[in-house]
């Protein structure tokens, strides 16, 4: 009932619950003293289904006959209407026509599955129902399956149809039966190639041709006898994308042509009996599996540096980088390292594992080459040969109005132009940078790009951190000799956390030298630009005064000669980078004790 | 009233081909499977090989893979069998049969003899 | 494959006997198992298909039993026409085979 009907009543015959097709008696009536006056014909009832008004009467009650309700539940309400006042619900009623039972479709599970039918029942009735399956094949066959569960919506006929005559047709229907009555549904008509699904494909194996070419490799698996169709699909494991071929008739092997060495790939396969009947099995279990290593394509990226010994030694260090996994094509066991002396032929071959630098010493005569290749387990890269020279002595090679920019919180735009001179004999250009660090340099990595010879900025972004400075020299090379520039740079930047130390004031003929600590290198927070030193008399208010000087990497320390004699002064240092100033390093009290003038 | 008329049969020498022929008529052919089912003399029967209707799906015996070609021309009603690389142990009368939930109609048969 | 072996292989029976042949599948079949008849020199007659049920124009004293494995043949009074060999053969899967035989002989 539609809310609590404290005015009246609404009542259905036959039942509330009919087939399609009945008729429904409704009648609605008023409970005593509920009407808008005693005078009955003043009391207009008024029927609506759903929102329409479908019949209406004067008195206190209502009869309608209502017939061709639709499937599903239909709401009827009864109100009251008073002169000069609202319509007042007194009652309502919801009428449900049985639904048939909807959307059978049947599916056999593998070539010796059984047939299994399912279907929707319709909206809830709340009557007791039975459901009666039925499939009937050809020459009269005929099989039945009952389901007493209310709620059934799933049979299995539990018998398989055969391949061997796979263009039989078979019809199956569902009966829903109970008190009302009985409804079927439509009939499902088909063959055993429209409703068997195959077992997905098993005991996948993969097979690579010999050492060779792996572009080829053979899948190969095990099939249901009367798959025709079946598609492939494979990728990397570290891949989302997946590779899809459709192949016919393939009888249990496939052989793949795009495979990529060295990379563990996901195969899964799915097999489907024909090209426009029945359904995809489900996806085989996946195989893993790696492809064979191939020999090293590409060649190294190979640069160098050399350092000046002694009169008649050289330190060369070579670093190259990692060839890209699809250049390696395998583990790279080692490299190999060849030193040659052209005139005189002397050759030092050396395989290094676990690094990609090398460093020697060599005599500071001769012409050198070197040869760089990569090896794994198929065997070597091509070798990249250079030869060995003097890479800033060219003056006139030297690019200039070098600059260098923050672009972003790791990376740096660098910035030159051409050599003066020469210009048509550059090559490439080579942008170079390490983190600055005094002192002893050696065992900071070195980075490096190449740039093509019309080229004149490059964004570097590879081991780039805030708030460090790095040194940075492009490298303008020819056929035989290279000129250099270089500049301090620093992507994102601030002030210095803190000033210089101040560790020593000594008196030098009528001056004073300053020495100080430099600020610990986390704490630079990008590249010094400045050196600040401030002093003022002790216990005076005036100005300090200050003397700016330009950062130079080994400097740590700088003359002052404009104190006076026998004044006790108070001295500190700030640093600054192109973002601001330091706060004051430490203060410092220092009398002169020259003559005065 | 289905038929099925085998043709073709003969004497052929070991490693000889010959052609087998049924012509159906009575039933609407392309809507069956077609079969070729064989009997040595004094043996039981062997089936040989099927076809569906739309020669989509093909079956053979593993004893005569191979050297058996089984084809149909729906427009003709005919169903075929190429026998190629004959031994004597393909000697049988051989017959064409419709499938439905097995052998329901079969032709009167054609003998092949294979001897040298 | 999937084997059939049919007992006995030979019955001797009089008109008027009930006689009962056997068939049994290497593995599951469910119901697709046939029976034919078959006389000297000529086609099989088909006389059972889906294990149980009569081929037109099969005289009913002939009958089919059996699922999954195990199958039987049974003619309830033998007539005069009925003495011939007797084969099964299944239909779930192919390759397609068919028992041995069973003759049935006068008495």
């Known amino acids: 009932k539609i809310d609590e009907c404290k005015r009246g009543d609404v009542t259905v015959k036959p039942s509330r619950v009919i087939l399609l097709g009945s008729t429904v008696n409704i009648s609605c009536s008023l409970k005593p003293r509920q009407g808008c006056s005693p005078y009955s014909r003043r009391n207009k009832l008024i029927l609506y289904k759903f929102d329409r008004r479908i019949n209406f009467h004067h008195g206190h009650s209502l009869n309608a006959q209502v017939t061709g309700l639709p499937l599903g539940t239909t709401l009827f309400v009864c109100k009251l209407a008073c002169i000069n006042s609202d319509e007042i619900q007194i009652c309502g009623a919801e009428i449900l026509v049985g639904e048939q039972p909807q959307n059978l479709s049947c599916i056999q599970k593998g070539e010796q599955g059984t047939v299994a039918c399912t279907w929707e029942r319709g909206q809830d009735t709340h009557l007791y129902t039975e459901y009666t399956l039925q499939l009937s094949g050809p020459k009269n066959l005929t099989w039945q399956k009952q389901c007493k569960d209310h709620y059934c919506d799933y049979l299995d006929f539990g018998i398989n149809l055969t391949p061997e005559s796979p263009e039989s047709n078979f019809t199956a229907k569902v009966t829903a039966v109970n008190s009302l009555g009985s409804s079927s549904s439509f009939p499902s008509t088909f063959t055993f190639l429209d409703i068997v699904r195959p077992l997905p494909p098993w005991d996948i194996r993969i097979k690579f041709q010999k050492a060779s070419s792996v572009s080829r490799c053979t899948l190969y698996w095990r099939d249901e006898g009367l798959v025709l169709l079946n598609r492939l699909r494979y990728r990397p494991s570290n891949s989302r994308h997946w590779n899809m071929v459709n192949v016919t008739e393939a009888r249990g092997r496939h052989d793949l042509l795009d495979l990529k060495p060295f990379t563990e790939y996901e195969f899964q396969i799915s097999s489907k009996l024909h090209l426009y009947k029945g359904s995809w099995s489900d996806w085989s279990e996946t195989l893993r599996a790696q492809t064979p290593e191939e020999e090293p394509t590409g060649m190294l990226d190979v640069w160098y540096m050399k350092r000046h010994i002694d009169y008649s030694r050289q330190q060369i260090s070579l670093f190259w980088k990692n060839l890209s996994v699809s250049e390696a094509r395998g583990k790279i066991l080692h490299y190999q390292v060849t030193l040659q002396e052209l005139t005189g032929g002397k050759v030092m071959t050396q395989n290094i594992t676990g690094h990609t630098s090398w460093t020697t010493v060599i005599s500071r005569t001769g012409n050198w080459a070197v040869a760089v290749s990569a090896a794994n387990s198929k065997g070597n890269s091509l070798p990249t040969r250079i030869n060995i020279m003097n890479l800033c002595e060219a003056g006139l090679l030297a690019p200039h109005q070098v600059s260098a920019n923050s672009e972003s919180m790791d990376s740096i735009l660098v910035t030159w132009q051409p050599p003066r001179k020469d210009l048509s004999a550059v090559q490439e250009y080579v942008v170079e940078w390490r983190q600055l660090h005094p002192g002893d340099d050696t065992q900071i990595p070195l980075n490096w790009l190449r740039s093509p010879p019309y080229n004149v900025s490059a964004l570097i972004s590879e081991n780039i951190k805030p708030y460090t400075c790095y040194e940075i020299r492009v490298y303008a090379l020819s056929e035989d000799q290279g000129g250099c520039s270089s500049i301090l740079g620093n992507s994102e930047h601030k002030a210095p956390l803190s000033g210089p130390h101040i560790n020593a004031i000594t008196e030098e003929k009528g001056s004073i030298l300053i020495s100080w600590n430099s600020i610990p290198v986390q704490e630079q927070m990008g590249c010094l630009l400045h050196y600040r030193i401030y002093w003022k008399e002790r216990d005076s208010n005036s100005q300090p005064q200050l003397c700016e000087i330009p950062y130079r990497v080994s400097q740590n320390s700088h003359p002052i000669n404009s104190l006076q004699p026998r004044v006790t002064y108070v001295l500190w240092m700030t640093a600054l980078t192109a973002a601001g100033e330091s706060s004051q390093g430490n203060e410092r009290e220092f009398c002169l004790q020259g003559k005065a003038n | 009233e289905v038929l099925l008329v085998e043709s073709g049969g003969g004497l052929v020498k070991p490693g000889g081909s010959l052609r087998l022929s049924c012509a159906a008529s009575g039933f609407t052919f392309s809507s069956y499977s077609m079969n070729w089912v064989r009997q040595a003399p004094g043996k039981g029967l062997e089936w040989v090989s099927s076809?569906?209707?739309?020669?989509?799906?093909?079956h053979y015996a593993d004893s005569v893979r191979g050297r058996f070609t089984i084809s149909r021309d729906n427009a003709k009603n005919s169903l075929y069998l190429q026998m190629n690389s004959l031994r004597a142990e393909d000697t049988a009368v051989y017959y064409c049969a419709r499938s439905e939930l097995g052998f329901d109609y079969w032709g009167q048969g054609t003998l092949v003899t294979v001897s040298s | 494959d999937i084997q059939m072996t049919q007992s006995p292989s030979s019955v001797s029976a009089s008109v008027g006997d009930r006689v009962t042949i056997t068939c049994r599948a290497s593995?599951?079949?469910?119901?697709?198992l046939a029976w034919y008849q078959q006389k000297p020199g000529k086609a099989p007659k088909p006389l059972i298909y889906a294990a149980s049920s009569l081929q037109s124009g099969v005289p009913s004293r002939f009958s089919g039993s059996g699922s999954g494995t195990d199958f039987t043949l049974t003619i309830s009074s033998l007539q005069p026409e009925d003495f011939a060999t007797y084969y099964c053969q299944q239909a779930n899967s192919f390759p397609l085979t068919f028992g041995g035989g069973t003759k049935v002989e006068i008495k």
């Open positions: 593995q599951g079949i469910s119901i697709w």
């Open positions: 076809i569906s209707s739309s020669s989509d799906y093909i």
